[in-house]
């Protein structure tokens, strides 16, 4: 395996200035699968880095990744999605640092969508729901999903719940009354493949009502 | 070449402990997960479980779990199963192989005779 | 667990002729065109050698008249045209969901 020390004690002696991180994104595009990279040090000079994949690929050996900015990018249906394959940032032909990567690893979900939140009165609920495009794909179909909501003023104080179904009630009683609350949802593979959060949506505010008492309650 | 060269027989009495080594050379260690397979004479093959020598992250078959403990060695290009509390059951030959994905073995040491017995 | 049943346990094929076993699996070990399904050669006193993985991948270094193919419960090894040296156990072995089993094996033997 070219440009790999023949042992773990050497391994360290890569360059760490070119360290980088990967995340795939299967039929992102269609049937099309995507692979992003990036260096970890935003600073690193990109000028003459190229970001090349071999092995675990159909029908070709290696591939070049295309550079937008400052991420590295492929968009093909050429990965096998068995075995690893080698990632190597190179100049001029020779490479400065190489990972072995199992693309099933590092899998990155879509963010969720549409997003939005119905209170019920009779009930005295809000149910939440929102979309994903991983329903309709025919990998990655099963995902674990982070619903995180707060009171607007609350900055860091999230609630999150976790779900695997794209449908959560939050009862009235649990929520502070007449607030505006703030809710978001991400995704992360959840069956066989490994990998990443998504993006998180768009947040989507609502607005809790005032406590209704019943007839012959008084106000505290 | 790509090798993993495993530690030689043992004979253990019930109830006591074994630690079989696995070390491998001709490839960066740290890049392939590395399994541990038990033979019992005349049968077929059973995972015990896998290790991580990047992380050191583990995952043992749930039958094996509370008496099976796999380490590993970077320094030294290793990794380690020790299995505990010893029984007659498990009189094996134990197999290190390299997972060339997830999981499939495409690598293997040459085995380890474990056998237990008073 | 996923069980792995192989079929048949033995058999004899003369050399030159074709030798085929199947693996029957009690769930699914396939997503869409992945299909978690590998198989193994073991000569006696010898640990055993991956053959094919991905149902369909010939390991590099293993000669192609060993095939695989099947996709969901159903995979098969195919050996064709066989040789005197391919008398061997092989077994199949499943990875989409732990723990890892392997089927109960099959006896070639070449006559």
């Known amino acids: 395996e070219s440009g790999y020390a023949q042992n773990g004690d050497l391994e360290d002696a890569e360059l760490d200035d070119y360290s980088f991180s990967c995340y795939s994104q299967l039929e992102v595009n269609g049937s099309q699968h995507s692979l992003t990279c990036a260096f970890e040090d935003p600073d690193v000079n990109t000028t003459n880095l190229e970001f090349e994949i071999c092995g675990a690929l159909v029908e070709v050996k290696c591939l070049s990744f295309r550079k937008l900015q400052e991420i590295y990018f492929i968009e093909t249906k050429k990965f096998l999605l068995i075995g690893k394959s080698n990632i190597c940032v190179k100049v001029g032909g020779k490479s400065l640092t190489c990972k072995k990567i199992d693309l099933t690893t590092i899998v990155k979900p879509e963010a969720p969508f549409d997003l939005s939140v119905i209170y019920r009165e009779g009930a005295n609920d809000f149910v939440v729901t929102f979309n994903t495009s991983h329903l309709q794909k025919k990998y990655v179909k099963v995902l674990m999903h982070d619903v995180a909501y707060r009171q607007e003023k609350d900055e860091n104080k999230w609630m999150h719940v976790n779900l695997s179904s794209t449908k959560l009630t939050l009862l009235q009683r649990n929520l502070q009354p007449e607030a505006m609350y703030e809710i978001k949802v991400r995704s992360i593979p959840d069956h066989y493949f490994k990998g990443f959060w998504s993006e998180w949506s768009p947040s989507y505010y609502f607005r809790t009502p005032e406590i209704n008492n019943s007839p012959g309650e008084m106000d505290p | 070449q790509v090798q993993l060269v495993q530690s030689g027989a043992e004979v253990k009495k019930p109830g006591a402990s074994v630690k079989v080594s696995c070390k491998a050379s001709?490839?960066?260690?740290?890049?392939?997960?590395l399994h541990w397979v038990k033979q019992a004479p005349g049968q077929g093959l059973e995972w015990i479980g896998g290790?991580?020598?990047?992380?050191?992250?583990?995952a043992y078959n749930q039958k094996f779990k509370g008496r099976v403990t796999m380490t590993s060695d970077r320094s030294t290009s290793t990794v380690y199963m020790e299995l505990s509390s010893l029984r007659s059951e498990d009189t094996a030959v134990y197999y290190c192989?390299?997972?060339?994905?997830?999981?499939?073995?495409?690598?293997w040491g040459q085995g380890t005779t474990v056998t237990v017995s008073s | 667990d996923i069980v792995l049943t192989q079929s048949p346990a033995s058999l004899a094929v003369s050399p030159g002729q074709r030798a085929t076993i199947t693996c029957r699996t009690s769930?699914?070990?396939?997503?869409?065109?992945?299909?978690?399904m590998h198989w193994y050669q073991q000569k006696p006193g010898q640990p055993p050698k991956l053959l094919i993985y991905?149902?369909?991948n010939l390991e590099s270094g293993v000669p192609a008249r060993f095939s695989g193919s099947g996709s969901g419960t159903d995979f098969t090894l195919t050996i064709n045209p066989v040789e005197a040296e391919d008398t061997a156990n092989y077994y199949c072995q499943q990875s989409i969901k732990d723990p890892y089993t392997f089927g109960g094996g099959t006896k070639v033997e070449i006559k």
């Open positions: 769930e699914s070990v396939s997503i869409h065109l992945l299909h978690l």
């Open positions: 192989a390299r997972s060339g994905g997830r999981w499939y073995f495409d690598v």
């Open positions: 001709g490839y960066r260690f740290t890049d392939y997960e």
């Open positions: 991905g149902a369909s």
């Open positions: 290790i991580d020598p990047k992380t050191g992250g583990t």
